[in-house]
């Protein structure tokens, strides 16, 4: 519990005075927050938050879903917390099944435990399928299992959180990992034709093809030495995972002599940029 120095605001004090508390399902949770400037209790687990303005938090019959962090806050904005596990042999995991990971970053499989004293808290592949040999994780009973350094090859991986209970593996609901790729190269850009010679009044149409690992690649047609916004149309396709193609078509329905010049198709992602140009020459009808 926090020590009090006179004159200086101190955090509230919680009874029982431990950082973690384990109660059995069906038992009572009784938490007392002592502070002259008590404001509220806050309960958090996964994406759920509840508040209580009473300084004593009482849950008469605890359920697994009462597992979480209970924080008492005072009028100075100072707080103190206790984490409560509600041990329920029938519900070992709380689960949020959304699972997205950015390539090369860590991502959290949100399956916190209701009992921190179980063993072999780990990940298992669905239907007995093996997990990638290089997959590594950091377990945290209060948060879930953090997959380290997500690889592109983990995309669409089906997995369960797993613990051992009385000599048997118990699995959580299944998770499907969706991996957002990291840009590791500049976009690949190409143009349908490098140069055009048209008569005035003819239609100018040119297509730029942009290829990258995801649709978040940025692309635009620009006219060199001009700020004018050009009219372009897009078509796009996903050719399987991490193989995205966009076609940006620039059209001038009736080309004029002063439309002559260099047009650049520019694309960029977080790794860098690439461009390709096409030259238009418009001659008068004579």
């Amino acid at each position: 519990q926090p020590s009090v120095s006179p004159g200086e605001p101190s955090p509230p004090s919680i009874h029982p005075g431990k950082s973690d508390l384990i109660v059995r399902v069906g038992d009572e949770i009784r938490l007392l927050c002592t502070d002259p400037g008590f404001v509220k209790w806050t309960f958090e687990i996964l994406d759920e938050t509840n508040e209580n303005k009473q300084n004593e938090w009482i849950t008469e019959k605890a359920e697994a879903t009462n597992t979480g962090k209970y924080t008492c806050t005072n009028k100075h904005g100072l707080s103190n917390s206790i984490y409560v596990f509600v041990r329920d042999p029938a519900k070992l995991f709380l689960v949020d099944r959304s699972l997205y990971g950015k390539e090369d970053n860590d991502t959290l499989v949100r399956c916190p435990l209701t009992d921190p004293e179980v063993t072999n808290y780990s990940l298992k592949g669905c239907q007995g399928k093996p997990l990638p040999k290089d997959l590594r994780f950091i377990p945290d009973p209060k948060a879930g299992i953090m997959i380290k350094s997500v690889k592109r090859a983990y995309h669409r991986l089906c997995l369960h959180c797993s613990v051992d209970q009385e000599g048997k593996s118990v699995l959580s609901e299944k998770f499907i990992l969706k991996v957002r790729p990291a840009f590791k190269a500049v976009p690949v850009v190409s143009v349908s034709k490098a140069s055009y010679l048209l008569r005035e009044g003819e239609e100018f149409t040119v297509t730029c093809t942009i290829k990258d690992v995801s649709s978040s690649v940025y692309s635009t047609w620009k006219r060199e030495n001009s700020q004018t916004k050009l009219q372009e149309k897009y078509n796009s396709w996903h050719h399987g995972d991490f193989n995205y193609e966009r076609q940006a078509t620039l059209t001038i329905s009736s080309a004029r002599v002063n439309d002559s010049g260099v047009f650049m198709c520019y694309a960029n992602n977080t790794f860098g940029s690439a461009n390709v140009t096409t030259t238009l020459e418009v001659v008068d009808k004579g």
């Epitope: 780990s122 590594r136 950091i138 945290d140 350094s149």
Partner: nanobody, 126 residues
Framework: EVQLVESGGGLVQAGGSLRLSCAAS????????MGWFRQAPGKEREFVAA????????YYADSVKGRFTISRDNAKNTVYLQMNSLKPEDTAVYYC???????????????????WGQGTQVTVSS
């Protein structure tokens, strides 16, 4: 570079107890995992137990569950293996292993640990 030094091995009667220690030099991060493996003469190295450094979650082989307990002392950078109700088939050289990249999905696979101690002999007589 991590150095691991085991101690606590010895000769014990069946049904007796021993406590092995493994001291790690250098700083242990939250991604750390430390484990115990054993190798009996003519047999492959087998997983015994492991512990994650950050939350202290524990992992056991079925053959030792309920008899052996793995624990850690963060301040001393040391992992312990308390072995109770020892059997003659527990006789082996016990190795401490560590890795800084997190718990392997296949935490019982010795090939997935980067650092190893020299081993300490445990002999259980009948």
């Amino acid at each position: 570079e991590v150095q691991l030094v085991e101690s606590g091995g010895g000769l014990v009667q069946a049904g007796g107890s021993l406590r092995l220690s493994c001291a790690a030099s250098g700083r242990t991060s939250g991604s750390y995992v430390m484990g115990w493996f054993r190798q009996a003469p003519g047999k492959e190295r087998e997983f015994v137990a492991a512990i994650s450094w950050s939350a202290g979650m524990t992992y056991y082989a079925d053959s030792v569950k309920g008899r052996f307990t793995i624990s850690r002392d963060n301040a001393k950078n040391t992992v312990y293996l308390q072995m109770n109700s020892l059997k003659p088939e527990d006789t082996a050289v016990y190795y401490c292993a560590a890795d800084q990249r997190g718990v392997p999905a296949y935490y019982s696979d010795y090939a997935l640990y980067d650092y190893w101690g020299q081993g300490t002999q445990v002999t259980v007589s009948s």
